[in-house]
């Protein structure tokens, strides 16, 4: 039922740059839908999910890839000032919806050179599955998002 007491990971990135976030989920949720969402008072507003969405807008700046084997990767590109806020990885798995990891994103003034800021998940150990296979489970194509 979520990671009790886990703090959001604070990430700072300049305008125009990108971030790469990795979230870990339980192997038994390999086929479950994964969601990257932005926290509002009402809850977490989905931005992108692992379900195939052929209606995705051409100008989308957030991409989610389910790498399989318990690893989810989210990339937010061409960051703008209005992207500052609270985000989370969520899985709608066997135990119901769970927040895997929270990220607090601060946007800084633009840098000279654009760069990608990489970030890992605090949830790694909490959601590792010692009984899982050593070989990563490669999800089928329709479990991956299509940018």
């Amino acid at each position: 039922q979520g990671i009790v007491g886990s703090l959001p990971e604070v990430l700072q990135a300049p305008v125009g740059s990108s971030i790469l976030v990795q979230c870990h989920y339980r192997l038994q949720d390999v086929k479950a839908q994964k969601v990257w969402c932005r926290f509002l008072p009402e809850g977490c507003q989905p931005l992108v999910s692992s379900a195939v969405d052929r209606r995705a807008p051409a100008g989308r700046r957030t991409f989610l890839t389910d790498l399989g084997g318990g690893l989810l990767q989210v990339e937010m590109v061409t960051l703008q000032e209005e992207d500052a806020g609270e985000y989370g990885c969520m899985v709608d798995g066997a135990r119901g919806p769970q927040i895997l990891h929270r990220v607090s994103l601060n946007i800084l003034p633009p840098e000279e050179e654009e760069e990608t800021h990489k970030i890992g998940s605090l949830a790694e150990n909490a959601f590792s599955d010692p009984a899982g296979s050593a070989n990563p489970l490669e999800p089928s194509q329709d479990e991956k998002s299509i940018p």
Epitope: G2, C37, F39, E42, Q45, P46, E86, M90
Partner: antibody
Framework: QVQLEQSGAELVRPGVSVKISCKGS????????MHWVKQSHAKSLEWIGV????????RYNQKFKGKATMTVDKSSSTAYMALARLTSEDSAIYYC??????????????WGQGTLVTVSA | SIVMTQTPKFLLVSAGDRVTITCKAS??????VAWYQQKPGQSPKLLIN???SRYTGIPDRFTGSGYGTDFTFTISTVQAEDLAVYFC?????????FGGGTKLEIE
Amino acid sequence: QVQLEQSGAELVRPGVSVKISCKGSGYTFTDYSMHWVKQSHAKSLEWIGVISTYYGDVRYNQKFKGKATMTVDKSSSTAYMALARLTSEDSAIYYCARAPMITTGAWFAYWGQGTLVTVSA
Amino acid sequence: SIVMTQTPKFLLVSAGDRVTITCKASQSVSNDVAWYQQKPGQSPKLLINYASSRYTGIPDRFTGSGYGTDFTFTISTVQAEDLAVYFCQQDYSSPYTFGGGTKLEIE
């Protein structure tokens, strides 16, 4: 199972304030936002506002700004709502309510039992 | 604010009757409408969300339909335990608003 347990009925004098509580159990409290709803004979059901139980961010119905203040205590899995400068128009049943989803949605599958606030001199 | 106008306010029916309640939004709310049942002395209970999806465990005699501004809630065969007040609600935009309620009485 999900339960929202509210504090007991309040009989208060006009002009004073009251603070009612809503304790969530049977789920991860900080994963789900908490809403507050007023029910009175005159106005049916009215949405007061919502608070993020993790971040403490709030969104109020403009009508209740200055009247209601929502807070949360994560350590006790309890949401609170204070009502200020009470008048007879504030006499009502107040409910806390929770959506069934972590994602955004303001329809309510879980309700507290309600707290009756009566304002009387 | 979006106003949800619910009609009728009262319904007197017999067991076995078909009942229809309507809700009209003052502007389009897509399909972001829920319907609730509130029995005397109880908290409201969610019956329908997304205008037409029955919530978990809700009997199939309760149905909802509509999109945009016009929504309908139907009880196909009223039973004695359906005595209650029924409310519509939009969660399309804040402030989230409810209809005035329909009191269903069984004769």
